[in-house]
């Protein structure tokens, strides 16, 4: 009869353990089951901001190719102009070729007419070599008309269809360059 | 709050090198650019190096070719590489990040001196 009770005993226990392993089981399911819907939460959130911001360029930016381009309302020195893109994530235009610039002017022409706008384009005090902001040199087609007579820096701007060069202190509009975003589709 | 934290400045004789380092962090938003700026005695704060967060990267004339800037996103870290330095690389240079809210934060500065 002791052991009748003993082998029951010993069921039960083994029960009461397979019982407490599929709540275990159970937690185990149930926490990677929150995990994967808090992921598929994040990651639709993620595809619907993604879906919202995927225009390649931000409003009221002009897109050629892999670039966009920002034409100012406003007028600024040269080094504040430097700022102003940056504040927008972008740098002052970087003319690479004579395509890039017959686009700049052709966009400007139907937008504002024949004004002056800053580029990333100064000439060194000492050397006087023009360079991009970056440190590249301009391309031979992509120099400055005319050098300016100043004794203060010297910086490249944008009128109808030629590059020249002034003051970088003087006032104009400026152009911001940042790079598209490349469509997922 | 957002802090920013930087390092690496010191006394380097002409010629020689040093490399500067900014960490963000905090309750910064996006970051769209990330520059470093310097202040001489008696002169105004000047942009030296700028990068974006696509990677496009502005410089002064007086540092194209002997400084370099570049960043780790993931970090939100930006490093100035100063070669070649001269005594008018004398400053405090300062840290300063545009954050895609629009807010703009500086650093407290370092200073880097350029002297046999």
């Known amino acids: 009869k002791l052991l009748q009770v003993s082998t029951i005993a010993m069921q039960q226990q083994e029960k009461l353990i397979q019982q407490e392993r599929a709540l275990l089981n159970f937690t185990e399911w149930k926490r990677s089951c929150a995990l994967q819907m808090k992921y598929c939460q994040a990651f639709m959130q993620n595809s619907l901001s993604s879906a919202h911001n995927s225009s390649p360029c931000p409003n009221n930016w002009i897109q050629n190719r892999e670039s966009c381009y920002y034409v100012s309302e406003i007028w600024s020195i040269w080094h504040t102009s430097q700022e102003n893109c940056l504040k927008e994530g972008s740098t002052l235009l970087q003319i690479e070729s004579k395509e890039e610039m017959d686009f700049i002017t052709g966009s400007l022409r139907k937008i504002k007419g024949s004004y002056d706008y800053w580029v990333g384009l100064s000439q060194d005090g000492h050397s006087g070599r023009w360079l991009w902001q970056d440190g590249s040199s301009p391309s031979p087609g992509l120099l400055p008309a005319e050098r300016s007579q100043s004794a203060n820096q010297v910086c490249g701007y944008v009128k109808s269809n030629s590059l020249l060069s002034s003051n970088c202190s003087t006032w104009k509009y400026f152009i911001c360059e940042k790079y598209a975003l490349r469509s997922s589709v | 709050q957002v802090q920013l934290q930087e390092s690496g400045g010191g006394l380097v004789q002409p010629g020689g090198s040093l490399r500067l380092s900014c960490a963000a962090s905090g309750s910064i938003s996006s970051i769209n650019a990330m520059g470093w700026y310097r202040q001489a005695p008696g002169k105004q704060r000047e942009l030296v190096a700028a990068?974006?967060?696509?990677?496009?990267?502005t410089y002064a004339d007086s540092v194209k070719g002997r400084f370099t800037i570049s960043r780790d996103g993931a970090k939100n870290t930006v490093y100035l590489q100063m070669n070649s330095l001269k005594p008018e690389d004398t400053a405090v240079y300062y840290c300063?990040?545009?954050?895609?809210?629009?807010?703009?934060?500086w650093g407290k500065g370092t200073q880097v001196t350029v002297s046999s």
């Open positions: 300063k990040v545009f954050a895609a809210d629009g807010m703009e934060y």
């Open positions: 990068i974006t967060g696509q990677g496009r990267t």
